[in-house]
């Protein structure tokens, strides 16, 4: 089956202190290799969250990607701040044998746009 | 069939104001996010603002931030842009511009209103 | 923001003839790019999305191509009504949503 990442939602407004998820499915799981979360693109991208195990403060996975044959690769920001505003990107990589992982597929990008919290 | 009408354009002095309207039809206004969109004379198309269907998340371009502001009224099915601070450079045909529902591309756009800004 | 720089500036050719345009991104935008049309006095269409997808209407004559950072709009035969300026835009690094300088395609 093609590969593709969906990111249903284009933008989410989510109120500063609360939390938010940021959709990700994939048709595919092949080629092997891991999926991860980054905010915005090119040299200035910062990682958000990767499914490969290690601890990121605030962002979780939705479901259990350790499922066999788990498509969603969703993730949850908790306690939002007006500083994660952005474009986040859901991207899939392919494992390489020696060298550094290849990108090789990407959602089209969930914009978060953080509201003042209600007083 | 879509619609988009605009309208308020005209010439103005450098440093005043001038309120721009899109009438749409054909669609579910409320379930669309709405742009505008601008061309200068002899120069190339410029993305100016955006804002969500349910007016809550909006972005503008770096050289009308501050300056312009976009908002709609889903009652009325009409899109407005408020340009304040008008500079010679605003000079353009001012497109107003729907989204489609899915990704940040153009499905219908309107036919365009001129804006000269001029001493 | 990602700049999209378009090529040629203008493209002379007869009707009948093959037109090749190229959209070029300063970083890669998947396949997350379109292709618009413009005539003077008229809105602009619509013509590709998604980098190869046609538009509703749009006649196969049009097609795109490329992934990436290199993209190409092709109009297999130029008729009468395809001499107009092409814009391609990419919706993957945004905000800011950018578009590409325009391609001019004139009658020789």
């Known amino acids: 089956k093609e590969l593709k990442v969906t990111q249903p939602e284009k933008s989410v407004s989510v109120a500063a202190g609360d939390s938010t998820v940021l959709n990700c499915t994939l048709t595919s799981l092949l080629p092997v290799g891991p999926i991860k979360w980054y905010r915005g693109v090119g040299q200035s991208r910062l990682l958000i969250y990767s499914f490969t195990g290690e601890h990121f403060p605030r962002v979780t996975n939705v479901s259990d990607a350790t499922k066999r044959n788990n498509m969603d690769f969703s993730i949850r920001i908790s306690n939002v701040t007006p500083e994660d505003a952005g474009t986040y990107y859901c991207v899939k990589f392919q494992k390489g044998p020696s060298e550094p992982d290849t990108e090789i597929q990407s959602g089209g990008g969930t914009e978060v746009y953080v509201l003042a919290k209600p007083s | 069939d879509v619609q988009l009408v605009e309208s308020g354009g005209g010439v103005v002095r450098p440093g005043e104001s001038l309120r721009l309207s899109c009438a749409a039809s054909?669609?579910?206004?409320?379930?669309?996010?709405m742009n505008w969109v601008r061309q200068a004379p002899g120069e190339g198309l410029e993305w100016v603002s955006l804002i969500s269907g349910s007016g809550e998340i909006i972005y503008y371009a770096d050289s009308v931030k501050g300056r312009f502001t976009i908002s709609r009224d889903n009652s009325k099915n009409t899109l407005y842009l408020q340009m304040n601070s008008l500079r010679a450079e605003d000079t353009a045909v001012y497109y107003c511009?729907?989204?489609?529902?899915?990704?940040?591309?153009?499905?219908?756009w309107g036919l365009g209103t001129l804006v000269t800004v001029s001493s | 923001e990602t700049v999209l720089t378009q090529s040629p500036g203008t493209l002379t050719l007869s009707p009948g003839e093959r037109a090749t345009l190229t959209c070029r991104a300063s970083?890669?935008?998947?396949?997350?790019l379109a292709w618009y049309q413009e005539k003077p006095g008229q809105a602009p269409r619509l013509l590709i999305y998604g980098a190869s997808s046609r538009a509703t209407g749009i006649p196969d004559r049009f097609s795109g191509s490329g992934s990436g950072t290199v993209f190409t709009l092709t109009i297999s035969s130029l008729q009468s009504e395809d001499f107009a300026v092409y814009y391609c835009?990419?919706?993957?690094?945004?905000?800011?949503?950018?578009f590409g300088g325009g391609t001019k395609v004139e009658i020789k």
């Open positions: 970083q890669s935008v998947y396949t997350y």
């Open positions: 511009a729907k989204e489609n529902n899915r990704y940040r591309f153009f499905d219908d």
């Open positions: 054909g669609f579910t206004f409320s379930s669309y996010d």
């Open positions: 835009q990419q919706y993957y690094d945004r905000p800011p949503l950018t």
